[in-house]
Structures are given as structure tokens and as C-alpha cells.
């Protein structure tokens, strides 16, 4: 009669929870049985993010830290079942925690928009296009961002118009701008549940141009035209 290791009821245990569950929430459980009828002690292996704790007696798994889908889902850890009261034989199974997205990331600019410029003086109103993104999951359809100016005082000089769910156009309302940098605040709303807003800044320089680039005295880098 050879002593056998515990046997898990499944090779892979899978559970699904919202990424915003409270710390201490039960997120799943695993079960193993020992062929000799001995009790089992459960432990986790590979919990690199430190998110989980297993009850070593019952096999119930609880969250011990905030979960974040954007860090990667599913979150995979190993579960070890060790025979209690005998030779300490053990078996290993997998626990996969699928994290359901919560709208918890505000919109932001999709790339670095430093270096935007218009040649001064403007001969006609100008415009430039920018793109927004966020780190939440958008199933079946892309993001549906809406765009507006970040403060009322900007409305005399600028207007923002939506192109599609991710892109918008920033346009000047007139041509009477000084030769300097203007910081234009844009409010981006993701329309999610709950809706999250990000206020981003687009720095736009009005400068004298030489061959289509901003002219700067020696020692300054050229700005490149983005519109």
C-alpha cells in the first residue's frame, strides 16, 4: 500500500472577479483530496504581485491587496496541496484569476505632443489633430471619447472638434496670436461607468519659421511642425 500524493479535483482552477473588489474578498477556492483520507494544507506559489492569500485549511483564496486588470489578466499562480500528518507528499495545480475591467483609468494623450507649432504670424486660422487613449478594456467597440476645452477663457482663441472616438482637431479661432508658447487645456471624457475625465495640456508654440521649422537662435533646437 503505497502512500500517494493529494489529488486536485481540477488541473486548472479558474475564477472571475471585478478588479475593484474589496481587500479580503474571497475570489475563489481550490480542492484536493488525499487518497489516504488525510487532511490537506494548501499554499500558493508564484504570487509575484502579492495579491492573494490562501486559507491553508479550506483552500479558499482571498485578495489581500488591490487588484489591477491593467497589470495583466488572467493572473496565474500555482497552488500546492500538501498531505498533513503523513509524509508531506504534495501536488501542484494552477489558479487563474480573470479580472473584469472597471473603468478606473482616465483618458490621456496617446503620445507626446511637445513640439507643436504654428508659423507666426498666421496667415489663416490653423488646426492640428491629436489622439486620446486610456488603459481600460474596450470590448466590441473602441473608446468613445468626447473632447472640450479645459477652461472657458480658452474659448476666445481656440476650438476643439471631435473627429471620431479617439481623435479630435484643435483649431485657432483667429490669427492674432503672439509669438510665444500657449498651453491649451483639453478635457477628455471617456463616457464610461462611471465616466472618467482627464484634463491634458497641449503646448502650442507660435514662432518665426525658417524653411517650415521654428527658428531659434543658436543653441536652441528646432521645433518640428505637427499640423
Amino acid at each position: 500500500d503505497v502512500n500517494e500524493a493529494p489529488q486536485f479535483s481540477q488541473h486548472v482552477f479558474q475564477a472571475k472577479v471585478s478588479e475593484d473588489v474589496a481587500i479580503g474578498t474571497k475570489v475563489g477556492n481550490v480542492t484536493a483530496k488525499d487518497p489516504e483520507g488525510l487532511d490537506i494544507s494548501y499554499s500558493l506559489r508564484g504570487d509575484t504581485r502579492g495579491w492573494l492569500k490562501i486559507d491553508h485549511v479550506t483552500g479558499e483564496i482571498f485578495s489581500v491587496a488591490p487588484l489591477d486588470r491593467e497589470a495583466g489578466s488572467p493572473y496565474r499562480v500555482q497552488v500546492v496541496a500538501t498531505e498533513v500528518g503523513g509524509s508531506s507528499l504534495s501536488s501542484v495545480s494552477e489558479f487563474h484569476l480573470i479580472l473584469m475591467d472597471v473603468n478606473d483609468n482616465p483618458p490621456r494623450l496617446a503620445k507626446d505632443y511637445t513640439g507643436l507649432f504654428f508659423c507666426h504670424p498666421l496667415s489663416a486660422p490653423g488646426s492640428l489633430i491629436f489622439e486620446a487613449t486610456d488603459d481600460d478594456q474596450h470590448l466590441f467597440r473602441g473608446p468613445h471619447f468626447t473632447f472640450s476645452l479645459g477652461s472657458g477663457s480658452l474659448q476666445n482663441d481656440w476650438e476643439v472638434s471631435k473627429i471620431n472616438g479617439t481623435h479630435a482637431r484643435l483649431s485657432t479661432r483667429h490669427t492674432e496670436f503672439e509669438e510665444r508658447e500657449y498651453v491649451v487645456l483639453i478635457r477628455i471624457n471617456d463616457g464610461g461607468r462611471p465616466p472618467l475625465e482627464g484634463i491634458v495640456s497641449l503646448p502650442v508654440t507660435f514662432c518665426s519659421c525658417v524653411e517650415g521649422s521654428c527658428f531659434r537662435p543658436a543653441g536652441h533646437k528646432h521645433h518640428h511642425h505637427h499640423h
Epitope: 487532511d39 499554499s43 485549511v57 508531506s88
Partner: antibody
């Protein structure tokens, strides 16, 4: 025969810590879970946590997480419980108990209890 | 947490009388993980019945246990003087394991 011998009564001041012991004999200490349970007139029997001396695995009642630390010393077959930041509500009789090695999870042997009184 | 409600809280019985006390769980508990303990004043609890119906070593045969799901009971077929004590039910299906508030059995 199986015995769990607990340390003596403790009188401690609020805010202090206390460490109590539970010495096992008559069985293989590393092969059974040791549980800690407290008893108060108001709350009855409350499970605090458990440790498996074989590998140090432990589990805590969420209510006591941060308040309690469970350890086990294989060489002396002794389990320890440290209670921190004591208040008058922690005045109670604290029991250690052995969990049967069978899959019932029953606690088949209990220590005689350690009485903790928190008072200034 | 699974809440165990014991009734009655206090009861008295004459010697030789049949006694039944109940334990109701707030959610279903596997019968393997439902246990009863006896405690007398000044003493620690003793395992009395494990896995719903199995008598612990040294427990007299007049004791029995039964139940399933959310409803469990402990019965003494013929009350004896030494049975006067407090009886606690206990579940360890889910963590944290929980205890009932006890039924105190007195001699009438």
C-alpha cells in the same frame, strides 16, 4: 497521550503586547494544524487563526489580521501566539487546539487555556 | 462568514429525559464539517460529536447527532447528571470557522 500545555495567565496594560505558548506532546507536532480560539462572555468562541507547523503555513481570521502573529518552533514542539496593541476587548481566555489529521477539520484536543486580562 | 444560531440558549431537563438542541447555519454546510463540543465551567471545550453524527472517543452512546444543509441537531436519549454543560456547534466548511453561541443544558 496527546496533551497541549498552555502558558500561565497574563495581566497586561492597554497598548502592550503579549506572547503565549502552547506546548504539544504525545504526537508528531509537525503533522497537525494548531488553531487558536478565544472565549469571552460577550462574543463566545471566536476562531483567531491556525498554523501548520510542518511548513509554517498559516491562516488568520480577517478580524484579527494585524493584531495577531502565529509561529511554531519545531524543536520544542511549541506553538506561539503574539497579540499586539491590546485593549480591554482583548481580555479573554485563549485556547490552542489541535486539528485532527482527518478531513473533518474538527479540533480534537484543546489546551487548558490562557487567561489574558487587559487593565490599566 | 457563516453564522450558526443555536436554540434554545438555555434549557433544563430532568434525569432520564430526552433532550434535543438545534444548530441552524446561515448558509449550507457540508455534514463532514459540522461538529459539536461540550464545555463545563472552568474547563476547555471537548470534541463531542464530529462530522454531524460521529461520537468522539469516550462519549456515551446516549448522545447522537443528525442533520444536513443548514439544520443540525444534538440529541441525548436519556439525560444524565454529567451531561449538564454548554454545547457548541462549529462549522469548518468555510473560513473563518465559526461557532454557535452555545446551548446551556441544566438539570431540572
Amino acid at each position: 497521550q496527546v496533551q497541549l500545555q498552555q502558558s500561565g495567565a497574563e495581566l497586561v496594560k492597554p497598548g502592550a503586547s503579549v506572547r503565549m505558548s502552547c506546548k504539544s506532546s504525545g504526537y508528531t507536532f509537525t503533522s497537525y494544524n494548531i488553531h487558536w480560539v478565544r472565549q469571552t462572555p460577550g462574543q463566545g468562541l471566536e476562531w483567531i487563526g491556525a498554523i501548520y507547523p510542518g511548513n509554517g503555513d498559516n491562516s488568520y481570521n480577517q478580524k484579527f489580521r494585524g493584531k495577531v502573529t502565529l509561529t511554531a518552533d519545531k524543536s520544542s514542539s511549541t506553538a506561539y501566539m503574539q497579540l499586539n496593541s491590546l485593549t480591554s476587548e482583548d481580555s479573554a481566555v485563549y485556547y490552542c487546539a489541535r486539528q485532527t489529521a482527518r478531513t473533518t477539520r474538527a479540533m480534537d484536543y484543546w489546551g487548558q487555556g490562557t487567561t489574558v486580562t487587559v487593565s490599566s | 462568514d457563516i453564522v450558526l444560531t443555536q436554540s434554545p440558549a438555555i434549557m433544563s431537563a430532568s434525569l432520564g429525559e430526552r433532550v434535543t438542541m438545534t444548530c441552524t447555519a446561515s448558509s449550507s454546510v457540508s455534514s463532514s464539517y459540522l461538529h459539536w463540543y461540550q464545555q463545563k465551567p472552568g474547563s476547555s471545550p471537548k470534541l463531542w460529536i464530529y462530522s454531524t453524527s460521529n461520537l468522539a472517543s469516550g462519549v456515551p452512546a446516549r448522545f447522537s447527532g443528525s442533520g444536513s444543509g443548514t439544520s443540525y441537531s444534538l440529541t441525548i436519549s436519556s439525560m444524565a447528571a454529567e451531561d449538564a454543560a454548554t454545547y457548541y456547534c462549529h462549522q469548518y466548511l468555510r473560513s473563518p470557522p465559526t461557532f454557535g453561541s452555545g446551548t446551556k443544558l441544566e438539570i431540572k
